[in-house]
Structure formats: C-alpha cells, structure tokens
Interface confidence: low
Amino acid sequence: IPVIEPSVPELVVKPGATVTLRCVGNGSVEWDGPPSPHWTLYSDGSSSILSTNNATFQNTGTYRCTEPGDPLGGSAAIHLYVKDPARPWNVLAQEVVVFEDQDALLPCLLTDPVLEAGVSLVRVRGRPLMRHTNYSFSPWHGFTIHRAKFIQSQDYQCSALMGGRKVMSISIRLKVQKVIPGPPALTLVPAELVRIRGEAAQIVCSASSVDVNFDVFLQHNNTKLAIPQQSDFHNNRYQKVLTLNLDQVDFQHAGNYSCVASNVQGKHSTSMFFRVVESAYLNLSSEQNLIQEVTVGEGLNLKVMVEAYPGLQGFNWTYLGPFSDHQPEPKLANATTKDTYRHTFTLSLPRLKPSEAGRYSFLARNPGGWRALTFELTLRYPPEVSVIWTFINGSGTLLCAASGYPQPNVTWLQCSGHTDRCDEAQVLQVWDDPYPEVLSQEPFHKVTVQSLLTVETLEHNQTYECRAHNSVGSGSWAFIPISAGAHTHPPDEFLFTP
C-alpha cells in the first residue's frame, strides 16, 4: 500500500499557502483528486509529488494515491481543506443526474471543518426541502439525498453558518429520472367486438408510463387512425387515451384494430377483432358426441357452447323422456362465460339412475330466435341372467334370458358336480350361442336376449350354467337338476351394480 506524506488523514491550510503532497510506493504511483487549478506534478519512479504554491478554496478535496501494479489494488488518501473565510463551499459539479431510488450526492465540499456543525441543505431562494427528504452530510463529500424521488428534481444550495449568517454555495441542479421498466403498458377495450350493421360502437386504446415521453396510436388493418388524444396523470403514471366512436357501423369498419405505444425502451402492441354482422345470431355446439353412452351409476356432464350476439334472453335444460316427467334440477345446471360472446352451459348428471336415460335438450333464446341442441343418453348395464327349465315341442329345454346394454353375449357351460359357478377344472362342455333371440330392443332400454339349450336328458350330478357378458360386466345363473325337479341358483351378488 502506498504511503502519503504528510502522514495525516486531513490537512487544513489557508488560501495562498504552499502545499506539498508526496506519495511513495513499491512501484510507480499515481495521484487522483478533484479537478482544480495550480497543481504541479513531479514523478520519479516509485514516488510522486503533488504541489501548489498558491492554494485556493478550489483545491479543497480528497487526494488519493494508488499503485497500479499492486494486485491488491491498495490506495492511500488525504483530505485537504483550504480554509477561505469568504468561500465556505467548493462545488465540484453543478448538475447531478440519478435514477429514482438511487442515492444522489450533491458534491459541495466544506472548505473549513470547523463549520460542519452549522451546515444545512436548502432549495434555491431559501425554500425548505420537501417533506420526507432524507439526507446526510459528509464534510469530505457533501450532501447525500437518500433514495431520491422524481419529485425531488430541484435546484439545491449548501448552506454554512459563518459569524452568525448563512453563506450559500452556488446552486446544484438535481435531476431524478424515472426508472422506465419497459415500453408503456397498454389496454385495448373491448378485447373482441361484435355489432349489427347500423349499431354504435366504441374502441378505446390507452397507454400509460412513469415517463411522459411516449407515443400511442390506434390502427385499423395497418392504417393509422387520426384520433384526438386525451392525456392525464394519476397514480404517478402518465396516461394517453385514444377513443374511437362509431355512430353507425358498417362492414368497412370490421377488421383488426391494433393499439401501439412506444418509448425509449421499445414498443408494445395489442390487437382486437371487430366483427360486423348483418343480423343477430345464435349458434349452439358441443365438443361431445350428441349420442352418449354411460354405465349406470356413473356421472356425466353435458356441455353446450353458445356463441351469440346480442346476449341471451333465456336458456334452460329440458328432459324430453321417455321415462318420466322429471326435469333437471337447476342446481345441477352451470353457466360459465368464456368471453363476451361465448358461453358454456353444463348439466351435471351424477350417479345416473335407469329413469334418467333419454333425451336432454338445451334451449337458448336471443333476438335472433330460439335454438336447441339435444343429447341422447343411453345407459349401459351389466347383464342380469335367469334360467328356467321347460319343454318346447316335447323336448326338454333350458331357457336363459339375459338383459343388459350393450346386448349381452351368451355362453352355456356344463360342468360336473353341483356348483354355484362352473370353474375351469369342472367344465365338461361349453356352447357359445352366436345368435340369441332378441326379445326386446327399445331405445334407451336394456336389450333382452333369450338363448335355448336343448337337453335330451338332464344329468343329475351336473350343473348347467348360462353366462352372459357385455362391455360393462358379466352375469351368470347356475341350473342344478335334482331328482325332485329342477333347481336354479342365481349368482351370489358377485356382479352387483347399482
């Protein structure tokens, strides 16, 4: 680290005095200090001498000696006061520029350390500082305004009390610049617009920024529109608003509108689409299939998307049968607005019961008329099976009835022993019935099929089982011939479904 002679942190001299500052280091050394007149510099290798024969108040300041070759970057400093009774302040700069929330140093250096107790900072013409101005003073550096605000952009003077009177420095202009985070913020209202030809419309483009220096314009299909601009300042932001009023819209007004704003940081733009239509419209659609199949006991949400202008005057869900005259509960119907002209309507059908199969219609109305969208809901059921023993045309026949949806397939099994259900080890024969007779097949109902197995003689130590299955599940019924007559076994609720 270089060494300064005289080896004192501060040196106080009178105007006209000779001052010699010597710096010695291991290698070459350099002086750094405030720009002031009358200094002479002598250097010889590892030492450097700064001297003046006629010190003035302008020589007041901190002089630093550095050793450029020192990897640790060490330095030494001495502060010189040139104590001029007529000049208590040495102002190093008359304009200071900072960004908001930075500390602003106003570099008025006190020429006499004795005066420190009576210093203050004022605005020019003796006006007091603004409220909430937080500042501190250092006789070596000057006044620091902490976390400067835009509103503190003013002309300041440093004041010192000398012989009972205040002596001012020359003025220092502080410019606090707003931190501009980016291009102006934009809003374009509405985000989408639909009007019938001849109706009125309004499009508002507004931009705001912390700084007043920005431009905003509205364009239609890439053509800049000449619209008077309204300006405002609130919430510490400058606002510029362009309002396009159309008394009677026509098709040439339709298209893309862009709101564009720019400043030094760049450009922002946002767009909307204006649609002009001949007359009111109402469109219903669904992303779902209009023919729905759901397993009994499960839930289903029916969703309808509505696009309409003007807005809806009425809407409701209706059950059209065929099972009962119940109507969907209002609490199960839900409406959500996606945007101004599009809505989604949902009907929730939790834990579907057999009587709830059928047609559900959504109806909506606006000045364009009524529209309806109808869903057909079929419930799926696992098969229910029963077997009886009968004689057909004199032949002993096992008759199996299976009902469910989708249509069940039927398989007959013959197995040894008396059992509720044939397992693989016991099976003697298996017959698939590829063409069971369909007994009933009405829309929204279960399909009932019948399968016949002609058995010339019933083997008494055997079980005949009818099994039916579909995509939902399976069901079975075991028939056990016993000497006192036939005996049947339903499944032990193994395939229970509500």
């Epitope: 759901v294 006991g297 499960e298 834990r351 229970f496 479904t497 509500p498």
Partner: antibody, heavy 117, light 110 residues
C-alpha cells in the same frame, strides 16, 4: 393370473401433486372397476373412489372431490390416480384394487407417498 | 372415526373359534352386502368374504361370514398362527355413495 403392479414410492412437498400408476395384467382390463384405497401409517383403510376403465367414468368420495383425478390408458391396461394440493396428512400407502362396484377382489402391492416439507 | 364399528382387537389360541363383529346402519349394512378383508403384516389387503358369506376360491372354509340387520360378523374356526392379521369389514353406503370400512380388528394368536 391377475396382477396389479403399482409405481414406486414418492416423497413430495406440501402443496405439490402426486400421480400413482397401476398396471393390470391377467384379465380384461375394461371388464372391472378399478378402485383406489389408501392407508395412513398405523391406520385403517379409506376408500377414495373408482374409475370404470371401459368408459373412463369416475366417482370419488366427497372428501377427495376437487383434489383427486382418476384416469386410465386402456392401450397399456394402466389406471392412474393423481392427488393434488398435498398435505402432511396425505402421507399413506395408496392401493389400487380391481373389483365390482362394492368390493375389491385383487389389490396392488401399494405405493407409499410421503408428504414432508 | 370409521363409519362401520369393529372391536380394535381380538385374540385366541390355536384351534379356537374367534368371532369379529361389525356394526353399521340402515344406509350401509342394512341395505347392502358386507365384505371382509384380511391384511397380513406388511402386505396389501386380500378379499376374504364377499356378499355377506361367499368365499373367493382359495380361501379356507375355516372363514365364514354372516349378516343380520345392520350388523355382520366374521367367524374363524380352528384358529392358526398364520391367521394373525388385521381384519376389515366393508360395505357400500347409499347415503355417502361410496365404500365404507370398519376401523379394523387386530387378531392375535396367543
């Protein structure tokens, strides 16, 4: 033979989500409901809900509504259960179980989900 | 607090007969069938009895189930050391629209 193989143990932070998988083999995946049941450490069994792999329809216990999502991929015979907004009291072993609506005849080996900050 | 009520523990000596009770209400056991599950230490539960009294294949006939009104019970005769496990009853509940379990009974073979 029927087998249900579940994904491995998970450690999650409160507020996160977990997704447990259950791969079925040895039977027709779409022919049976897949249920999810959980068991907190040292506690009893708690039913969460079911999915019908055939239709994709789901139903879950009121306690879990809005937090649990059950899905399936029939092409790989796999059911999934996702639980969101996890809390420390969701720490449990989560089981998938094949069955009919009211009971479960085959169970997965279980997946331990630990929720800890 | 479980919807179905079971005693927390039960015990017996090898060869003995042990019964575990399960009490519910009209919306569950009263109107639906009861199922029983066995959970051996450190393993997943296993279906023991379905539809009140039916045994899946592979379950020994030492295990039997019964139901009366809003209560059900599981009986294990000829108790063996490998029966030491937790036993859970379960049923569908019409008002909760879901499966409900008992709190479980820890069976100890002395």
């Amino acid at each position: 033979q029927v087998q249900l193989v579940q994904s491995g143990a998970e450690v999650k932070k409160p507020g996160a989500s977990v997704k447990v998988s259950c791969k079925a083999s040895g039977y027709t995946f779409t022919g049976y409901y897949m249920h999810w049941v959980r068991q907190a450490p040292g506690q009893g069994l708690e039913w969460m809900g079911w999915i019908n792999p055939n239709s994709g329809g789901t139903y879950c216990a009121q306690k879990f509504q809005g937090r649990v999502t059950m899905t399936r991929d029939t092409s790989i015979s796999t059911a999934y259960m996702e639980l969101s907004r996890l809390r420390s009291d969701d720490t449990a072993v989560y089981y998938c179980a094949r069955g009919r609506l009211t009971f479960f005849d085959y169970w997965g080996q279980g997946t331990l989900v630990t929720v800890s900050s | 607090q479980s919807v179905l009520t079971q005693p927390p523990s039960a015990s017996g000596t090898p060869g003995q007969r042990v019964t575990i009770s399960c009490s519910g209400s009209s919306s569950n056991i009263g109107s639906n069938t009861v199922n029983w599950y066995q959970q051996l230490p450190g393993t997943a539960p296993k279906l023991l009895i379905y539809s009140n009294n039916q045994r899946p294949s592979g379950v020994p006939d030492r295990f039997s189930g019964s139901k009366s009104g809003t209560s059900a019970s599981l009986a294990i005769s000829g108790l063996q050391s490998e029966d030491e496990a937790d036993y859970y009853c379960a049923a569908w509940d019409d008002s909760l629209n879901g499966v409900v379990f008992g709190g479980g009974t820890k069976l100890t073979v002395l």
